[in-house]
């Protein structure tokens, strides 16, 4: 069963490490995917010092732990790197963080995947 | 720490229910997708079920479809498994496991028993 | 219906290297199966090793590596230690909701 579920068809793409990665620095990126397979948008980003500095934003793969997530919200308290995702064209344009008082360590922090 | 506890399980006849549970804790529940994973004796691992964040989105083996139902009380911080209609072929340790990104289960119950026999 | 096929069986000496594979009937696996391995000794829960290909698990040693090798997910055991043997599960993420085990490979340590 899944309620209420919105397809993810394009996000907003950001890549800090644009020049090194050569692709561009800012955009919309287009989700694609095998067609049985759903998509997300993500965001990745660093609290230095209170100033937020954005990783990457882009498409996600399938990945359950974003189903029905309409926001892109970070809750773990206080990662390295924080990390959230997202069902919805361009859910990832605003993102925030909620932390909710996670007491466990992650195996690791996500990165994006490779295409 | 992370601690996935399930109970429930025990000895039921052929067509009668359980209701499974799973207390997770050690981290932030509801914001964990969570699965539920069989072994049937001497057998290998089978995926059963598994849930999305809020519980509005559940999938099943096709073998169970029909028969359990997941769900969640993000305010319990609890999993549930509840099977119905059940089968000897169902006769298996249940673990309750969490999925963290890039869909994996990143820690494991100990499992309980299921048996179903006459 | 997608069938995901292990080695039933591996032997490997003590100190010695041993790659398992984990492959399916619908097409080559790749990383966006996001294969994860999992170990697993008579009557304890299983233990996570890799996910998402090739990133190890928090406190597993380095002798435990994930790769895809042509068509097939692996997992290579490198300086094999008696405690590694064990049965070992792969799991294909398929998608929407879906994953699907490996029938296993249970893993002799000669000697």
């Known amino acids: 069963a899944i309620l209420g579920r919105s397809e993810t068809q394009e996000c907003l793409f950001f890549n800090a490490n644009w020049e090194k990665d050569r692709t561009n620095q800012t955009g919309v990126e287009p989700c694609y995917g095998d067609k049985d397979k759903r998509r997300h948008c993500f965001a990745t980003w660093k609290n230095i010092s209170g100033s937020i500095e954005i990783v990457k934003q882009g498409c996600w793969l399938d990945d359950i732990n974003c189903y029905d997530r309409t926001d892109c919200v970070e809750k773990k308290d206080s990662p390295e790197v924080y990390f959230c995702c997202c069902e919805g064209n361009m859910c990832n344009e605003k993102f925030s963080y909620f932390p909710q008082m996670e007491v466990t360590q992650p195996t690791s922090n996500p990165v994006t995947p490779k295409p | 720490e992370v601690q996935l506890l399930e109970s429930g399980g025990g000895l039921v006849q052929p067509g009668g229910s359980l209701r499974l549970s799973c207390a997770a804790s050690?981290?932030?529940?509801?914001?964990?997708?969570m699965s539920w994973v069989r072994q049937a004796p001497g057998k290998g691992l089978e995926w059963v079920s598994g849930?999305?964040?809020?519980?509005?989105?559940?999938f099943y083996t096709d073998s169970v479809k029909g028969r359990f139902t997941v769900s969640r009380d993000n305010s319990r911080n609890t999993l549930y498994l509840q099977m119905n209609s059940l089968r000897a072929e169902d006769t298996a340790v249940y673990y309750c496991?969490?999925?963290?990104?890039?869909?994996?289960?990143?820690?494991w119950g100990q499992g309980t028993l299921v048996t179903v026999s006459s | 219906q997608t069938v995901v096929t292990q080695e039933p069986s591996f032997s490997v000496s003590p100190g010695g290297t041993v790659t398992l594979t984990c492959g399916f009937n619908s097409g080559s696996v790749s990383t966006s199966y996001w294969p994860s391995w999992y170990q697993q000794t008579p009557g304890q829960a299983p233990r996570t090793l890799i996910y998402n290909t090739n990133t190890r698990s928090s406190g597993v040693p380095d002798r435990f590596s994930g790769s895809i090798l042509g068509n097939k997910a692996a997992l290579t055991i490198t300086g094999a230690q008696a405690d590694d043997e064990s049965d070992y599960y792969c799991v294909l993420w398929m998608g929407s909701g879906i994953w699907v085990f490996g029938g296993g490979t249970k893993l002799t340590v000669l000697g």
């Open positions: 496991a969490k999925v963290y990104y890039y869909s994996f289960f990143d820690y």
């Open positions: 050690g981290f932030t529940f509801r914001n964990s997708a």
């Open positions: 849930i999305s964040v809020t519980g509005g989105s559940t």
